[in-house]
Amino acid sequence: TIPPHVQKSVNNDMIVTDNNGAVKFPQLCKFCDVRFSTCDNQKSCMSNCSITSICEKPQEVCVAVWRKNDENITLETVCHDPKLPYHDFILEDAASPKCIMKEKKKPGETFFMCSCSSDECNDNIIFSEEYNTSNPDLLLVIFQ
């Protein structure tokens, strides 16, 4: 629970608690913003980001964004609050322990995004269908 000597200030989004009233500690995420990437046509890639950051707010999760256009491929790694859209998209998979890339519609480029909530989970980005729980065969295995 929140220690009694830690003041609760008004509108304080820096003190976040879970359902049991325990203080929620912040996530550690890879945070290199946008970098050029060689990740292409692979089942999974490492971010090659050497910066692990303490997310500023405890509710933030790790995010990775992979983009490919005619000129280059980039990978973006950040912390972000899942209550807020990122690149105009909702972070649907924020509670996932793994960063499973999902394609989003963006004109003029190929755009994949994932979010996750385990330490440095956006270091390993996964494109492979076998990890995607929208795959009915995988759901069958899970529920058997």
Partner: nanobody, 119 residues
Framework: EVQLLESGGGLVQPGGSLRLSCAAS???????RMWWVRQAPGKGLEWVS?????????YYADSVKGRFTISRDNSKNTLYLQMNSLRAEDTAVYYC????????????WGQGTLVTVSS
């Protein structure tokens, strides 16, 4: 009984240095991540720095990177925060905290030590 006892706070001039200590007892100190967290008057918690159980991996908030250094001595059950190039905005109560881990499911907090940076 679990205890985390911070010390080393005080009044320091801008540009000065302080070293905070946090003496731990009542739990397996080397198991899990430890944090320094601060709270400026009337503000929320700011997560300053963290260190893994073995001490090899350390993490810092952007606001203190390059100025603060976290370390731990597991043989002495003590966590440290070396604070250099202190600024007025570093004024706060500094808490050490142990994050819950798989082997230790509760988090623990110290009572805090006040750091005041003023000329």
């Amino acid at each position: 009984e679990v205890q985390l006892l911070e010390s080393g706070g005080g009044l320091v001039q801008p540009g000065g240095s302080l070293r905070l200590s946090c003496a731990a007892s009542g739990f397996t100190f080397g198991d899990g991540r430890m944090w320094w967290v601060r709270q400026a008057p009337g503000k929320g918690l700011e997560w300053v720095s963290a260190i893994e159980g073995a001490g090899s991996d350390t993490y810092y908030a952007d606001s203190v990177k390059g100025r603060f250094t976290i370390s731990r001595d597991n043989s002495k059950n003590t966590l440290y925060l070396q604070m250099n190039s202190l600024r007025a905005e570093d004024t706060a109560v500094y808490y050490c905290a142990k994050q819950a881990s798989r082997n230790s499911p509760f988090d623990y907090w110290g009572q805090g030590t006040l750091v005041t940076v003023s000329s």
